[in-house]
Interface confidence: low
């Protein structure tokens, strides 16, 4: 999916009002310095691409993020503010339902959510242009 035409301000508002707090809740008890950020993004569409991938694509050691509160709110925000996004996700959602597993917060998941926090921060702070 091409995130270029999303309403970035509305997505940012959704992040600020709820998603960020759900991420913090998920990470509660974890030191902010515990994980190094290894995933980055260069602009807002790129950030959303990386955020979608980390949030919804199961990875080795962490298969359960898609049903977390922050993930559901992320999905809702993208569906509302990114034209055509929800249509592209129907097949992916069906597949996800089939392989849903018991919820386990592993260290790998914590690391992944830490990466997500970094991506969201970058999404919320595009660098100012040098003048």
């Amino acid at each position: 999916y091409d995130f270029t035409n999303c309403d970035f301000e509305k997505i940012k508002a959704a992040y600020l009002s709820t998603i960020s707090k759900d991420l913090i809740t998920y990470m509660s008890g974890t030191k902010s310095t515990e994980f190094n950020n290894t995933v980055s993004c260069s602009n807002r569409p790129h950030c959303l691409t990386e955020i979608q991938s980390l949030t919804f694509n199961p990875t080795a050691g962490c298969a359960s993020l898609a049903k977390e509160m922050f993930a559901m709110k992320t999905k809702a925000a993208l569906a509302i503010w990114c034209p055509g996004y929800s249509e592209t996700q129907i097949n992916a959602t069906q597949a996800m339902k089939k392989r849903r597993k018991r919820k386990v917060t592993t260290n790998k998941c914590l690391e992944q959510v830490s990466q997500l926090q970094g991506l969201w921060r970058r999404f919320n702070r595009p660098l100012l242009k040098q003048q």
Epitope: E9, K10, K12, A13, Y15, L16, S17, R121, N124, Q130
Partner: antibody, heavy 121, light 105 residues
Framework: EVQLVQSGAEVKKPGASVKVSCKAS????????MNWVRQAPGQRLEWMGI????????SYNQKFKGRVTITRDTSASTAYMELSSLRSEDTAVYYC??????????????WGQGTTVTVSS | EIVLTQSPATLSLSPGERATLSCRAS?????MHWYQQKPGQAPRPWIY???NLASGVPARFSGSGSGTDYTLTISRLEPEDFAVYYC????????FGGGTKVEIK
């Protein structure tokens, strides 16, 4: 603990320039924006401009464009605001304010103590 | 530039009363921040992103609003609440409102 320490009070003549410094400590200087905001006696807060210490990018309030220059020295974790062609109405307290980009959402979460600039002939 | 208009300019109330401060934007903004300032002091962040209280801010404060209309409410004024409150937006550069002074009646 995040701290922003500004340079001392200045008295300048009309037409002169002033350069105010803001030394940051307690966080990674290049991680957050730095704003400059001023407040004339009894007046509202007035945003002047902002810098990304990470890459030196700036954005200014059009009202000050051409008169204000915001720079930074990353090795010293210090931001600077220079205002030129001073006039009496530039008499104000000048604040630097760190702007966090995390879940607080671009808010100016830490402020310097303020630098009083008096413009008088 | 987005202009923020705060009303009233001055609010004269007694401790224990409810205070309602308004901030209206000339164009729609995503959210609003509020700052408290006392004489001779730098502003302090008070409410982040429309409704999130800054650290140490008492629960008697609340923020609400969307689009062009935002409100800061103090349910029961305490002596330490008397100060000037400024709203600030980021949707288009950064601008502050003119401030509302909450003074003791």
């Amino acid at each position: 603990e995040v701290q922003l320490v500004q340079s001392g009070a200045e008295v300048k003549k009309p037409g002169a320039s002033v350069k105010v410094s803001c030394k940051a400590s307690g966080y990674t200087f290049t991680d957050d924006y730095m704003n400059w905001v001023r407040q004339a006696p009894g007046q509202r807060l007035e945003w002047m401009g902002i810098i990304s210490p990470y890459n030196g990018g700036t954005s200014y309030n059009q009202k000050f464009k051409g008169r204000v220059t915001i720079t930074r020295d990353t090795s010293a974790s210090t931001a600077y605001m220079e205002l030129s062609s001073l006039r009496s109405e530039d008499t104000a307290v000048y604040y630097c304010a760190r702007e966090d980009y995390d879940y607080d959402g671009y808010a100016m979460d830490h402020w310097g103590q303020g630098t009083t600039v008096t413009v008088s002939s | 530039e987005i202009v923020l208009t705060q009303s009233p300019a001055t609010l004269s109330l007694s401790p224990g009363e409810r205070a309602t401060l308004s901030c209206r934007a000339s164009s729609s903004v995503s959210y609003m921040h509020w700052y408290q300032q006392k004489p001779g002091q730098a502003p302090r962040p008070w409410i982040y992103a429309t409704s999130n209280l800054a650290s140490g801010v008492p629960a008697r404060f609340s923020g609400s609003g969307s689009g062009t209309d935002y409100t800061l409410t103090i349910s029961r004024l305490e002596p330490e609440d008397f100060a000037v409150y400024y709203c600030q937006q980021w949707s288009s550069n950064r601008t502050f409102g003119g401030g509302t002074k909450v003074e003791i009646k």
